[in-house]
């Protein structure tokens, strides 16, 4: 399987909310002995590779923000902790999973990574990640709403 990032760049005004999204693609083993662990974290372009460094998102670690389930079951973080930090991660039946960040500040700018771990018991873990950039802007040059740039081309879309 692979992880796709529909948008590689999100440009948002301060105070706006944004939902960063990843999508699980390809054949997903729905067997009883396969489970998935999905999470989010901040990173950098990488000492070893992009997303190899794991930093907290608003002081919450990848452990705090994880989703867990088998196959394509829906899941959502029920953590009061995440919601207190203006964060919520969720997953649907179609392989999409996301993190919503509320009331953005300039400090939220940076590289964000989604991580999917396919756990094949008796074999090994298979890790795949996706990366996307968030730019939070303020002042007269800031957009009125979030503008997202698709990964495949530089055509932008405005999210209202």
């Amino acid at each position: 399987f692979k992880v796709a990032t529909p948008y590689s760049l999100y440009v948002c005004p301060e105070g706006q909310n944004v939902t960063l999204t990843c999508r699980l693609l390809g054949p997903v083993d729905k067997g009883h002995d396969v489970t998935f662990y999905k999470t989010w974290y901040r990173s950098s372009r990488g000492e070893v590779q992009t997303c190899s460094e794991r930093r907290p998102i608003r002081q919450l670690t990848f452990q705090d923000l994880h989703l867990h389930h088998g196959g394509h079951q829906a899941a959502q973080t029920s953590h009061d902790l995440a919601q207190r930090h203006g964060l919520e991660s969720a997953s649907d039946h179609h392989g999409n999973f996301s993190i919503t960040m509320r009331n953005l500040t300039l400090l939220d700018s940076g590289l964000y990574c989604c991580l999917v771990v396919e756990i094949r018991h008796h074999h090994s873990e298979h890790r795949v990640h996706g990366a996307m950039e968030l730019q939070v802007q303020t002042g007269k040059d800031a957009p009125s709403n979030c503008v997202v740039y698709p990964s495949s081309s530089q055509d932008s879309e405005q999210i209202t």
Partner: antibody, heavy 117, light 107 residues
Framework: QVQLQESGPGLVKPSETLSLTCTVS????????WSWIRQPPGKGLEWIGY???????NYNPSLKSRVTISVDTSKSQFSLKLSSVTAADTAVYYC???????????WGQGTMVIVSS | EIVLTQSPATLSLSPGERATLSCRAS??????LAWYQQKPGQAPRLLIY???NRATGIPARFSGSGSGTDFTLTISSLEPEDFAVYYC?????????FGGGTKVEIK
Amino acid sequence: QVQLQESGPGLVKPSETLSLTCTVSGGSISSYYWSWIRQPPGKGLEWIGYIYYSGSTNYNPSLKSRVTISVDTSKSQFSLKLSSVTAADTAVYYCARDIPASAFDIWGQGTMVIVSS
Amino acid sequence: EIVLTQSPATLSLSPGERATLSCRASQSVSYYLAWYQQKPGQAPRLLIYDAFNRATGIPARFSGSGSGTDFTLTISSLEPEDFAVYYCQQRINWPLTFGGGTKVEIK
């Protein structure tokens, strides 16, 4: 704050079955691997196996024929059974939480098990 | 199974000195390697995961590096509480395996 506590007999006779339980407190047993690791006196660490919260297990091939790990989510406990023990199984036995794509981040304090007649 | 070889077996240093510990894998483990500290009579404590990510609450004097088969744990300036045994552990394949340990002792 999640804490782990091992319990069980400290002395087991050769050829018998070693049975230990690990109680998880202060957090959920969901979404992690729950492992057993042992350390013979003065030696290094050996991973015995894990049970995932879903009930799936994975054992070290060197011990697989003798090991059973089970979980009781209602009690937030997981257990180790090691059959046909010998003196070579004398060790400190640790239970630990293992995070997918990470490492053993929380350990019990360990319990010494001596195999002797 | 993947064999991890740690060197040196013992490192004799004084407080304030820099400690460099090595872990070599019998085959590539990518960057899926962790480091633990263990003091006498205590359980191991996670220091580093994925070669260089510090675990929660670990001081900045501990740093990890490397990928593939060769890894290093560096303690930039030894504090009295850092004298202990250090283990590396791989997680690219099961069974999970540990190195034999490096003892950092006071010179």
